[in-house]
Interface confidence: low
């Protein structure tokens, strides 16, 4: 029995619902009484949802899963996962048994966009060319871990003296803090770009230092 799932991971935003597609080709005369369907976590083999003996056996996964019962007879064994969390990320296997048996695994990639970075400067007054300043770029509640890039006003990448830390909160979302230590020129703009590698979403923050005063666009 051939079971088909998408090759590419299903990308779902945290808090939204995701559909993990799975289909099979029922033979003529097929009835749901013959169907055994199991969704499980590929790695741990934990049962997620099942259909057997003509009945939806329900969710074994925090009551957040559902089948499409009206579509099962047409060979649609897809699973709906509600209120996606970071912890849901991973591989789900769809097992279908009628007379023959088949299975396939689909990957769920969870994502959350990063907030617009906030920029802080230390010290933040009486700045002179030649002073060393610390610029902190903070962006919150994204997933997965971000890629952080710094550049100057001319678009030249700044890679030295950058320290980036990322810490997950209890939902598994990351807060990113990137610190750039730089020696001030006569004036300058420093930009931080926080990229979500899955969503290919960029969040920008910048600070312009003009001797005095400073501006935060």
């Amino acid at each position: 029995l051939e079971v088909q799932v998408p090759e590419d991971p299903v990308v779902a935003l945290v808090g939204t619902d995701a559909t993990l597609c799975c289909s099979f080709s029922p033979e003529p005369g097929f009835s749901l009484a013959q169907l055994n369907l199991i969704w499980q976590l590929t790695d741990t083999k934990q049962l997620v949802h099942s259909f057997a003996e003509g009945q939806d056996q329900g969710s074994a996964y925090a009551n957040r899963t559902a089948l499409f019962p009206d579509l099962l007879a047409q060979g649609n064994a897809s699973l709906r996962l509600q209120r996606v969390r970071v912890a849901d990320e991973g591989s789900f296997t769809c097992f279908v048994s009628i007379r023959d048996f088949g299975s396939a695994a689909v990957s769920l990639q969870v994502a959350a966009p990063y907030s617009k970075p906030s920029m802080t400067l230390e010290p933040n007054k009486d700045l002179r060319p030649g002073d060393t300043v610390t610029i902190t770029c903070s962006s919150y509640r994204g997933y997965p871990e971000a890629e952080v890039f710094w550049q100057d006003g001319q678009g030249v990448p700044l890679t030295g003296n950058v320290t980036t830390s990322q810490m997950a909160n209890e939902q598994g979302l990351f807060d990113v803090h990137s610190v750039l230590r730089v020696v001030l020129g006569a004036n300058g703009t420093y930009s931080c770009l926080v990229r979500n590698p899955v969503l290919q979403q960029d969040a920008h923050g910048s600070v312009t230092i003009t001797g005095q005063p400073m501006t935060f666009p």
């Epitope: 790695d43 741990t44 912890a87 810490m167 997950a168 909160n169 807060d175 803090h177």
Partner: antibody
Framework: EVKLVESGAVLVKPGASVKISCKAS????????MDWVKQSQGKSLEWVGD????????TYNQKFRGKATLTVDRSSNTAYMELRSLTSEDSAVYYC???????????WGAGTTVTVSS | DIQLTQPPASLSASVGETVTITCRAS??????LAWYRQKQGRSPQLLVY???TLPEGVPSRFSGSGSGTQFSLKINSLQTEDLGDYYC?????????FGGGTKLEIK
């Protein structure tokens, strides 16, 4: 070297409050969560709660809500836990521990022994 | 809350032996499980996190395995310094909870 230095042992009377401290050195306090863990004599470990020093967000184990109050003083790189309305059940060693990215604990303080006795 | 059970409460083994300590979770914690050793009068020391990852400085004779609800910590070639209490801790969601501990004694 990353270290957490906790305040010394205390003996307090029932009904009183106590505030114990945990000074971080070798790293910046605000870069990591600070967690607190209770261990009663001869017993296992119980997570009390944690504080994110960057945003002062606090998560308590429901069991310790109303019993423990977590605070930080970023200027001195020090975290505090205040325990109130103490009873003999609160007699224990209290550890501070640095909450790593994945929420396990790599760096621990030596523990503060709190004894509640009249 | 997720309960972690560590049978047995104590075990003893001889130097050079291989010892396995187990931990069972009341619900799926995926691979979010850490192991600690606590020597008498000392703070706990992290041995394993994410079920099988050893932090820097932990001897390679320690190894962790398991996922979901069943986990184990294996100590190859037991040394005298390995005596103490061993605790598992899940780091899947708050409240983080610890197992009741397994006391390892050296014969």
């Amino acid at each position: 070297e990353v270290k957490l230095v906790e305040s010394g042992a205390v003996l307090v009377k029932p009904g009183a409050s106590v505030k114990i401290s945990c000074k971080a050195s070798g790293y910046t306090l605000s870069d990591f969560n600070m967690d607190w863990v209770k261990q009663s004599q001869g017993k296992s470990l119980e997570w009390v709660g944690d504080i994110n020093p960057n945003y002062d967000t606090i998560t308590y184990n429901q069991k310790f809500r109303g019993k423990a109050t977590l605070t930080v003083d970023r200027s001195s790189n020090t975290a505090y836990m205040e325990l109130r309305s103490l009873t003999s059940e609160d007699s224990a060693v209290y550890y501070c521990a640095r909450g790593e990215l994945g929420r396990y604990f790599y760096v621990w303080g030596a523990g503060t022994t709190v004894t509640v006795s009249s | 809350d997720i309960q972690l059970t560590q049978p047995p409460a104590s075990l003893s083994a001889s130097v050079g032996e291989t010892v396995t300590i187990t931990c069972r979770a009341s619900e799926n914690v995926y691979s979010y499980l850490a192991w600690y050793r606590q020597k008498q009068g000392r703070s706990p020391q992290l041995l394993v996190y994410n079920a099988k990852t050893l932090p820097e400085g932990v001897p390679s004779r320690f190894s962790g395995s398991g996922s979901g609800t069943q986990f184990s910590l294996k100590i190859n070639s037991l040394q005298t310094e390995d005596l103490g209490d061993y605790y598992c801790q899940h780091h899947y969601g708050t409240p983080w909870t610890f197992g009741g501990g397994t006391k390892l004694e050296i014969k």
